[in-house]
Amino acid sequence: LCQGSNYSTCASCPSCPDRWMKYGNHCYYFSVEEKDWNSSLEFCLARDSHLLVITDNQEMSLLQVFLSEAFCWIGLRNNSGWRWEDGSPLNFSRISSNSFVQTCGAINKNGLQASSCEVPLHWVCKKCPFADQALF
């Protein structure tokens, strides 16, 4: 397994589990079904991953190629400011919002969008690849 936290860069790890996509140095899971934000988070954590934390504009642009108009939950929440689940602030992109009750973050091909956390959306998990796929 990759060493370090869920949020490490894991550059030396080779492969991804079934139904996960390898992109750069990480594995990404794009859900088919829809869940609320908390359930999406639990899904990812149960698979030794986390709701997508985007590190920079480059990663965001690469991922948006695989997205449609449909929104996907990501690991972004508004707790006195927009923060990723690893604790870092959102500082490379703006997020659209229409209401103060929209405190969870989502992404689609057009960018970041706030939403009420209870809304069922697709979601994206991110994790380090495994050295041996049988470990999954």
Epitope: N98, F100, V101, E118
Partner: antibody, heavy 118, light 107 residues
Framework: QVQLQQPGAEFVKPGASVKLSCKAS????????IHWMKQRPGQGLEWIGN????????NYNEKFKNRATLTVDTSSSTAYMQFRSLTSDDSAVYYC???????????WGQGTLVTVSA | NVLTQSPAIMSASPGEKVTMTCRAS???????LHWYQQKSGASPKIWIY???NLASAVPARFSGSGSGTSYSLTISSVEAEDAATYYC?????????FGGGTKLEIK
């Protein structure tokens, strides 16, 4: 497609109560806030309150808090607003509306015209 | 947060440019300031959201701008079908509030 269906009209006597319905279809009812608005003839819109059907938690405009009660029946995907102690000032069109992720209140019912008259 | 719209009623000829304003009693995030169009006998429709984003199917002659306590809706070249009442609304806190509306009449 998302639809909010409201009855066209209700006639009530002063001092009585009325329970207005808003039947939702075309989406997961428990996942989006339902708002209620009042509009007197020729006047502007007033927000009465909202309810989140998934948990039945709600918020009220202080002006209406003592006389309005918002409830839902998730089995029939219907939101209700009960209004008590009606007077002629309550004669108005009452709208329900649903929020969304991108646009704030893109879905509105057709409104129920409540007439309070002896 | 009280929203005050002006003018209450305005009249314009087809092709004219018109601007209506919405002033808030306290600052509103531009994300949370929206405009609705309501035609006689119909339900309101979301028209411009988050200050400047046109709702789907809204003609490009409409635009919105503003920040803080002052917002506006502009129609670059009015058409007959724009006759309606326009309401601003804030979603920055409870209670949600609407402005009193600006009724646009076409000459």
């Amino acid at each position: 497609q998302v639809q909010l269906q409201q009855p066209g009209a209700e006639f009530v006597k002063p001092g009585a109560s009325v329970k207005l319905s808003c039947k939702a279809s075309g989406y997961t009812f428990t996942s989006y806030w339902i708002h209620w608005m009042k509009q007197r003839p020729g006047q502007g819109l007033e927000w009465i309150g909202n309810i989140y059907p998934g948990r039945s938690n709600n918020n009220y405009n202080e002006k209406f808090k003592n006389r309005a009660t918002l409830t839902v029946d998730t089995s029939s995907s219907t939101a209700y607003m009960q209004f008590r102690s009606l007077t002629s000032d309550d004669s108005a069109v009452y709208y329900c509306a649903r929020d969304a992720t991108v646009e704030p209140l893109p879905y509105w019912g057709q409104g129920t015209l409540v007439t309070v008259s002896a | 947060n009280v929203l005050t719209q002006s003018p209450a009623i305005m009249s314009a000829s087809p092709g004219e440019k018109v601007t209506m304003t919405c002033r808030a009693s306290s600052s509103v995030s531009s994300n949370y300031l929206h405009w609705y169009q309501q035609k006689s006998g119909a339900s309101p429709k979301i028209w411009i959201y988050s200050t400047s984003n046109l709702a789907s199917a809204v003609p490009a002659r409409f635009s919105g701008s503003g920040s803080g306590t002052s917002y506006s809706l502009t129609i670059s070249s009015v058409e007959a079908e724009d006759a309606a009442t326009y309401y601003c609304q804030q979603y920055s806190g409870y209670p949600l509030t609407f402005g009193g509306g600006t009724k646009l009449e076409i000459k």
